[in-house]
Interface confidence: low
Protein backbone atom coordinates (compact mmCIF):
# COMPACT_ATOMS: atom_id res chain seq x y z
CA UNK A 1 0.00 0.00 0.00
CA UNK A 2 1.21 3.51 -0.86
CA UNK A 3 0.77 5.77 2.17
CA UNK A 4 1.47 9.00 0.24
CA UNK A 5 -2.15 10.21 0.24
CA UNK A 6 -2.91 9.68 3.92
CA UNK A 7 -4.08 12.53 6.14
CA UNK A 8 -0.93 12.66 8.27
CA UNK A 9 -2.24 15.29 10.70
CA UNK A 10 -5.26 13.15 11.57
CA UNK A 11 -3.06 10.08 12.01
CA UNK A 12 -0.76 12.06 14.29
CA UNK A 13 -3.75 13.18 16.37
CA UNK A 14 -5.00 9.60 16.73
CA UNK A 15 -1.53 8.41 17.68
CA UNK A 16 -1.05 11.03 20.36
CA UNK A 17 -4.58 10.57 21.70
CA UNK A 18 -4.76 6.77 21.96
CA UNK A 19 -2.20 4.59 20.16
CA UNK A 20 0.80 5.98 22.03
CA UNK A 21 -0.83 5.27 25.39
CA UNK A 22 -1.52 1.66 24.41
CA UNK A 23 2.04 1.18 23.19
CA UNK A 24 3.43 2.59 26.42
CA UNK A 25 1.08 0.40 28.47
CA UNK A 26 2.32 -2.63 26.52
CA UNK A 27 5.92 -1.65 27.31
CA UNK A 28 5.26 -0.98 31.01
CA UNK A 29 7.80 -2.61 33.25
CA UNK A 30 10.63 -2.16 30.80
CA UNK A 31 13.19 0.64 30.85
CA UNK A 32 13.67 2.81 27.79
CA UNK A 33 17.31 1.65 27.78
CA UNK A 34 16.39 -2.04 27.54
CA UNK A 35 16.30 -2.02 23.75
CA UNK A 36 18.44 -0.18 21.24
CA UNK A 37 16.22 1.74 18.87
CA UNK A 38 17.46 0.88 15.40
CA UNK A 39 14.50 0.90 13.04
CA UNK A 40 14.31 4.15 11.11
CA UNK A 41 12.24 5.83 8.44
CA UNK A 42 12.99 8.76 6.18
CA UNK A 43 9.61 10.39 5.51
CA UNK A 44 5.97 10.12 6.54
CA UNK A 45 4.83 7.47 4.00
CA UNK A 46 7.98 5.43 4.70
CA UNK A 47 7.35 5.66 8.45
CA UNK A 48 3.81 4.34 7.99
CA UNK A 49 5.07 1.53 5.76
CA UNK A 50 7.53 0.44 8.47
CA UNK A 51 4.89 0.85 11.19
CA UNK A 52 2.49 -1.35 9.23
CA UNK A 53 5.20 -3.99 8.70
CA UNK A 54 6.19 -4.21 12.35
CA UNK A 55 2.60 -4.10 13.59
CA UNK A 56 0.93 -6.53 11.22
CA UNK A 57 3.47 -8.64 9.37
CA UNK A 58 3.74 -12.16 10.75
CA UNK A 59 6.90 -13.04 12.61
CA UNK A 60 7.47 -16.34 14.37
CA UNK A 61 9.36 -14.59 17.14
CA UNK A 62 6.39 -12.47 18.16
CA UNK A 63 2.95 -13.87 17.48
CA UNK A 64 0.46 -11.63 19.15
CA UNK A 65 0.89 -8.02 18.04
CA UNK A 66 -1.96 -7.85 15.52
CA UNK A 67 -4.43 -8.71 18.28
CA UNK A 68 -3.13 -6.07 20.70
CA UNK A 69 -5.19 -2.94 21.38
CA UNK A 70 -2.58 -0.61 19.87
CA UNK A 71 -2.55 -2.71 16.68
CA UNK A 72 -6.33 -2.63 16.35
CA UNK A 73 -6.33 1.13 16.84
CA UNK A 74 -3.49 1.52 14.35
CA UNK A 75 -5.46 -0.46 11.80
CA UNK A 76 -8.59 1.61 12.41
CA UNK A 77 -6.62 4.84 12.11
CA UNK A 78 -4.98 3.84 8.84
CA UNK A 79 -8.31 2.65 7.45
CA UNK A 80 -9.90 5.96 8.40
CA UNK A 81 -7.23 8.36 7.13
CA UNK A 82 -5.56 6.50 4.23
CA UNK A 83 -7.79 6.23 1.13
CA UNK A 84 -8.28 2.62 0.01
CA UNK A 85 -6.23 1.17 2.88
CA UNK A 86 -9.05 -0.98 4.28
CA UNK A 87 -9.52 -2.78 0.94
CA UNK A 88 -5.88 -3.81 0.84
CA UNK A 89 -6.16 -5.29 4.32
CA UNK A 90 -9.02 -7.76 3.68
CA UNK A 91 -6.69 -10.72 3.03
CA UNK A 92 -4.56 -9.90 6.06
CA UNK A 93 -7.66 -9.72 8.25
CA UNK A 94 -8.84 -13.11 7.03
CA UNK A 95 -5.47 -14.62 7.84
CA UNK A 96 -5.54 -13.16 11.33
CA UNK A 97 -9.04 -14.55 11.94
CA UNK A 98 -7.47 -18.00 11.83
CA UNK A 99 -5.09 -17.07 14.61
CA UNK A 100 -5.66 -18.56 18.00
CA UNK A 101 -5.73 -16.24 20.99
CA UNK A 102 -2.26 -15.86 22.49
CA UNK A 103 -2.15 -15.73 26.25
CA UNK A 104 1.07 -14.05 27.23
CA UNK A 105 3.16 -11.12 26.12
CA UNK A 106 6.63 -12.58 25.71
CA UNK A 107 9.63 -10.30 26.00
CA UNK A 108 10.41 -11.25 22.42
CA UNK A 109 7.61 -8.91 21.37
CA UNK A 110 8.99 -6.08 23.46
CA UNK A 111 11.88 -5.44 21.07
CA UNK A 112 9.41 -5.07 18.22
CA UNK A 113 7.06 -2.77 20.14
CA UNK A 114 10.03 -0.70 21.29
CA UNK A 115 10.94 -0.20 17.62
CA UNK A 116 7.32 0.73 16.87
CA UNK A 117 7.44 3.49 19.47
CA UNK A 118 10.59 4.78 17.80
CA UNK A 119 8.97 4.73 14.37
CA UNK A 120 5.92 6.61 15.58
CA UNK A 121 8.16 9.22 17.22
CA UNK A 122 10.08 9.55 13.96
CA UNK A 123 6.75 9.92 12.12
CA UNK A 124 5.78 12.79 14.45
CA UNK A 125 9.21 14.43 14.02
CA UNK A 126 9.04 14.28 10.21
CA UNK A 127 5.57 15.78 10.45
CA UNK A 128 6.82 18.67 12.59
CA UNK A 129 9.70 19.32 10.15
CA UNK A 130 7.26 19.66 7.25
CA UNK A 131 5.13 22.28 9.04
Amino acid sequence: YDFTNCDFQKIEADYLRTISKDLITYMSGTKSTDFNNTVSCSNRPHCLTEIQSLTFNPTPRCASLAKEMFARKTKATLALWCPGYSETQINATQAMKKARKSKVTTNKCLEQVSQLLGLWRRFIRTLLKKQ
Partner: antibody, heavy 121, light 112 residues
Protein backbone atom coordinates in the same frame (compact mmCIF):
# COMPACT_ATOMS: atom_id res chain seq x y z
CA UNK B 1 20.11 -1.67 -5.83
CA UNK B 2 19.76 -3.92 -2.79
CA UNK B 3 23.06 -5.69 -2.27
CA UNK B 4 24.98 -7.83 0.22
CA UNK B 5 28.71 -8.33 -0.30
CA UNK B 6 30.65 -10.83 1.80
CA UNK B 7 34.40 -10.76 2.44
CA UNK B 8 36.99 -12.38 4.70
CA UNK B 9 36.93 -15.95 3.45
CA UNK B 10 40.01 -18.04 2.74
CA UNK B 11 42.10 -21.01 3.80
CA UNK B 12 42.61 -21.62 7.50
CA UNK B 13 44.07 -24.49 9.54
CA UNK B 14 41.89 -26.58 11.88
CA UNK B 15 41.59 -24.81 15.22
CA UNK B 16 42.16 -21.44 13.57
CA UNK B 17 39.96 -18.37 13.36
CA UNK B 18 38.42 -16.28 10.62
CA UNK B 19 36.13 -13.26 10.56
CA UNK B 20 33.58 -12.90 7.80
CA UNK B 21 32.07 -9.51 6.99
CA UNK B 22 29.02 -8.52 5.00
CA UNK B 23 28.48 -5.01 3.64
CA UNK B 24 24.85 -4.09 3.03
CA UNK B 25 23.62 -1.38 0.68
CA UNK B 26 20.44 -0.24 -1.05
CA UNK B 27 18.11 -0.72 1.93
CA UNK B 28 17.67 0.41 5.54
CA UNK B 29 19.95 -2.18 7.12
CA UNK B 30 18.87 -1.44 10.70
CA UNK B 31 15.27 -2.40 9.91
CA UNK B 32 16.07 -6.03 9.09
CA UNK B 33 17.10 -9.21 10.85
CA UNK B 34 20.16 -10.81 9.22
CA UNK B 35 21.16 -14.44 8.82
CA UNK B 36 24.24 -16.46 7.82
CA UNK B 37 23.66 -19.62 5.78
CA UNK B 38 26.38 -21.99 4.59
CA UNK B 39 26.74 -24.63 1.90
CA UNK B 40 29.41 -27.32 2.05
CA UNK B 41 30.87 -28.30 -1.35
CA UNK B 42 28.30 -30.31 -3.31
CA UNK B 43 25.85 -30.25 -0.38
CA UNK B 44 22.64 -28.47 0.58
CA UNK B 45 21.97 -25.28 2.54
CA UNK B 46 22.50 -25.10 6.30
CA UNK B 47 21.29 -22.30 8.55
CA UNK B 48 24.15 -21.01 10.72
CA UNK B 49 23.07 -17.98 12.74
CA UNK B 50 20.57 -15.11 12.89
CA UNK B 51 20.55 -11.73 14.60
CA UNK B 52 17.56 -9.45 15.11
CA UNK B 53 17.55 -5.87 13.88
CA UNK B 54 18.48 -4.39 17.26
CA UNK B 55 20.81 -7.28 18.23
CA UNK B 56 18.45 -8.15 21.10
CA UNK B 57 18.13 -11.78 20.04
CA UNK B 58 20.81 -14.00 18.57
CA UNK B 59 20.44 -17.61 17.46
CA UNK B 60 22.98 -20.28 16.46
CA UNK B 61 22.89 -23.75 14.97
CA UNK B 62 24.05 -26.38 17.47
CA UNK B 63 26.97 -27.21 15.18
CA UNK B 64 28.53 -23.74 15.65
CA UNK B 65 27.30 -22.75 19.12
CA UNK B 66 30.15 -21.62 21.36
CA UNK B 67 32.54 -21.26 18.42
CA UNK B 68 30.88 -18.68 16.15
CA UNK B 69 29.71 -15.18 17.08
CA UNK B 70 27.37 -13.11 14.96
CA UNK B 71 27.31 -9.33 15.36
CA UNK B 72 26.18 -6.25 13.48
CA UNK B 73 27.01 -2.56 13.29
CA UNK B 74 23.92 -0.69 12.14
CA UNK B 75 25.83 2.58 11.86
CA UNK B 76 28.16 0.96 9.32
CA UNK B 77 25.55 -1.26 7.61
CA UNK B 78 27.66 -4.30 8.31
CA UNK B 79 27.21 -7.85 9.57
CA UNK B 80 30.01 -10.05 10.90
CA UNK B 81 30.59 -13.69 11.74
CA UNK B 82 33.56 -14.41 13.98
CA UNK B 83 34.51 -18.07 13.55
CA UNK B 84 36.83 -19.67 16.12
CA UNK B 85 38.04 -23.25 16.68
CA UNK B 86 37.36 -24.03 13.04
CA UNK B 87 36.94 -27.64 11.94
CA UNK B 88 37.16 -29.38 8.58
CA UNK B 89 33.36 -29.70 8.55
CA UNK B 90 33.05 -25.89 8.61
CA UNK B 91 34.41 -25.82 5.05
CA UNK B 92 31.66 -24.19 2.99
CA UNK B 93 30.50 -21.20 1.04
CA UNK B 94 29.03 -18.77 3.58
CA UNK B 95 26.12 -16.59 2.48
CA UNK B 96 25.05 -13.37 4.14
CA UNK B 97 21.27 -13.04 3.84
CA UNK B 98 18.61 -10.53 4.74
CA UNK B 99 15.61 -11.81 6.64
CA UNK B 100 14.43 -13.97 9.46
CA UNK B 101 12.18 -11.25 10.88
CA UNK B 102 8.94 -9.40 10.21
CA UNK B 103 9.41 -9.12 6.47
CA UNK B 104 8.32 -11.93 4.13
CA UNK B 105 7.54 -14.14 7.10
CA UNK B 106 11.12 -14.68 8.14
CA UNK B 107 12.22 -15.89 4.73
CA UNK B 108 15.58 -14.89 3.30
CA UNK B 109 14.76 -12.47 0.51
CA UNK B 110 18.23 -11.14 -0.34
CA UNK B 111 21.42 -13.21 -0.64
CA UNK B 112 25.05 -12.21 -1.07
CA UNK B 113 27.32 -13.86 -3.62
CA UNK B 114 28.88 -16.05 -0.93
CA UNK B 115 32.42 -16.40 0.36
CA UNK B 116 34.39 -19.64 0.52
CA UNK B 117 35.92 -20.78 3.81
CA UNK B 118 38.29 -23.75 3.59
CA UNK B 119 39.49 -25.43 6.77
CA UNK B 120 42.40 -27.71 5.99
CA UNK B 121 45.92 -28.50 7.16
CA UNK C 1 14.51 -29.78 15.99
CA UNK C 2 12.33 -29.71 12.89
CA UNK C 3 13.50 -31.98 10.07
CA UNK C 4 12.59 -31.07 6.49
CA UNK C 5 12.37 -33.86 3.90
CA UNK C 6 12.15 -33.18 0.18
CA UNK C 7 11.09 -35.55 -2.61
CA UNK C 8 12.08 -36.42 -5.21
CA UNK C 9 15.84 -36.02 -5.01
CA UNK C 10 15.99 -35.14 -8.69
CA UNK C 11 13.55 -34.45 -11.47
CA UNK C 12 14.00 -34.49 -15.24
CA UNK C 13 11.33 -32.48 -17.04
CA UNK C 14 10.45 -31.73 -20.66
CA UNK C 15 10.17 -27.98 -21.37
CA UNK C 16 6.56 -26.87 -21.26
CA UNK C 17 5.56 -29.74 -18.99
CA UNK C 18 4.55 -29.27 -15.33
CA UNK C 19 6.74 -30.23 -12.38
CA UNK C 20 5.97 -30.80 -8.72
CA UNK C 21 8.25 -30.94 -5.67
CA UNK C 22 7.15 -32.13 -2.25
CA UNK C 23 8.42 -30.99 1.15
CA UNK C 24 7.45 -32.57 4.45
CA UNK C 25 8.24 -31.28 7.94
CA UNK C 26 8.60 -33.44 11.04
CA UNK C 27 6.09 -31.24 12.87
CA UNK C 28 3.43 -28.68 11.99
CA UNK C 29 4.72 -25.33 10.70
CA UNK C 30 1.48 -23.56 11.60
CA UNK C 31 2.15 -20.78 14.09
CA UNK C 32 -0.25 -19.54 16.77
CA UNK C 33 -0.62 -16.36 14.67
CA UNK C 34 -2.29 -18.32 11.87
CA UNK C 35 0.63 -18.24 9.44
CA UNK C 36 2.64 -21.22 8.23
CA UNK C 37 6.39 -20.67 8.09
CA UNK C 38 7.43 -22.56 4.98
CA UNK C 39 9.46 -20.97 2.17
CA UNK C 40 10.92 -22.12 -1.17
CA UNK C 41 14.23 -21.15 -2.79
CA UNK C 42 15.88 -21.87 -6.12
CA UNK C 43 19.63 -22.11 -6.54
CA UNK C 44 20.54 -21.90 -10.21
CA UNK C 45 23.87 -23.45 -11.30
CA UNK C 46 26.80 -21.33 -10.11
CA UNK C 47 24.55 -18.79 -8.40
CA UNK C 48 23.39 -17.88 -4.90
CA UNK C 49 19.96 -19.12 -3.86
CA UNK C 50 16.98 -16.83 -4.48
CA UNK C 51 13.64 -16.63 -2.71
CA UNK C 52 10.74 -17.99 -4.78
CA UNK C 53 7.82 -18.45 -2.38
CA UNK C 54 7.33 -17.32 1.21
CA UNK C 55 4.69 -18.32 3.78
CA UNK C 56 3.64 -21.35 1.70
CA UNK C 57 2.02 -19.55 -1.22
CA UNK C 58 3.20 -15.94 -1.58
CA UNK C 59 5.37 -15.36 -4.65
CA UNK C 60 8.45 -13.21 -4.01
CA UNK C 61 8.94 -10.08 -6.08
CA UNK C 62 9.81 -10.79 -9.72
CA UNK C 63 8.98 -14.50 -9.55
CA UNK C 64 6.99 -15.68 -12.61
CA UNK C 65 3.42 -16.82 -11.98
CA UNK C 66 4.18 -20.30 -13.30
CA UNK C 67 5.58 -20.95 -9.80
CA UNK C 68 3.02 -21.68 -7.09
CA UNK C 69 3.15 -23.02 -3.57
CA UNK C 70 0.53 -24.88 -1.59
CA UNK C 71 0.07 -27.09 1.45
CA UNK C 72 -0.54 -26.86 5.18
CA UNK C 73 0.72 -28.15 8.53
CA UNK C 74 3.42 -30.65 7.52
CA UNK C 75 2.90 -31.27 3.78
CA UNK C 76 3.84 -28.72 1.14
CA UNK C 77 4.18 -28.62 -2.63
CA UNK C 78 5.96 -26.37 -5.10
CA UNK C 79 4.49 -26.52 -8.59
CA UNK C 80 5.88 -25.21 -11.87
CA UNK C 81 3.02 -25.11 -14.34
CA UNK C 82 5.24 -25.11 -17.45
CA UNK C 83 8.94 -25.71 -16.94
CA UNK C 84 11.33 -23.45 -18.86
CA UNK C 85 15.05 -23.90 -19.49
CA UNK C 86 15.87 -21.15 -16.97
CA UNK C 87 14.13 -23.11 -14.17
CA UNK C 88 16.97 -25.64 -13.86
CA UNK C 89 18.73 -25.78 -10.53
CA UNK C 90 18.22 -27.05 -7.01
CA UNK C 91 15.02 -26.21 -5.15
CA UNK C 92 15.02 -26.01 -1.35
CA UNK C 93 12.22 -25.66 1.18
CA UNK C 94 12.94 -24.00 4.54
CA UNK C 95 11.09 -23.63 7.83
CA UNK C 96 11.46 -20.53 10.00
CA UNK C 97 8.85 -21.47 12.59
CA UNK C 98 11.50 -22.10 15.22
CA UNK C 99 15.24 -22.13 15.62
CA UNK C 100 17.25 -23.94 14.54
CA UNK C 101 15.80 -22.98 11.16
CA UNK C 102 16.19 -25.84 8.71
CA UNK C 103 16.27 -26.53 4.98
CA UNK C 104 15.19 -29.57 3.04
CA UNK C 105 17.92 -31.56 1.30
CA UNK C 106 17.09 -30.07 -2.08
CA UNK C 107 15.54 -31.28 -5.33
CA UNK C 108 17.59 -31.02 -8.50
CA UNK C 109 15.52 -30.09 -11.56
CA UNK C 110 17.00 -30.63 -15.00
CA UNK C 111 15.68 -30.40 -18.54
CA UNK C 112 15.22 -33.54 -20.63
Amino acid sequence: EVQLVESGGGLVQPGGSLRLSCAASGFTFSNYDMTWVRQAPGKGLEWVSSITFASSYIYYADSVKGRFTISRDNAKNSLSLQMNSLRAEDTAVYYCTRGGGAYHGGSLDVWGQGVLVTVSS
Amino acid sequence: DIVMTQTPLSLSVTPGEPASISCRSSQSLLHINGYTYLHWYLQKPGQSPQLLIYLVSHRASGVPDRFSGSGSDTDFTLKISRVEAEDVGVYYCEQTLQTPYSFGGGTKVEIK
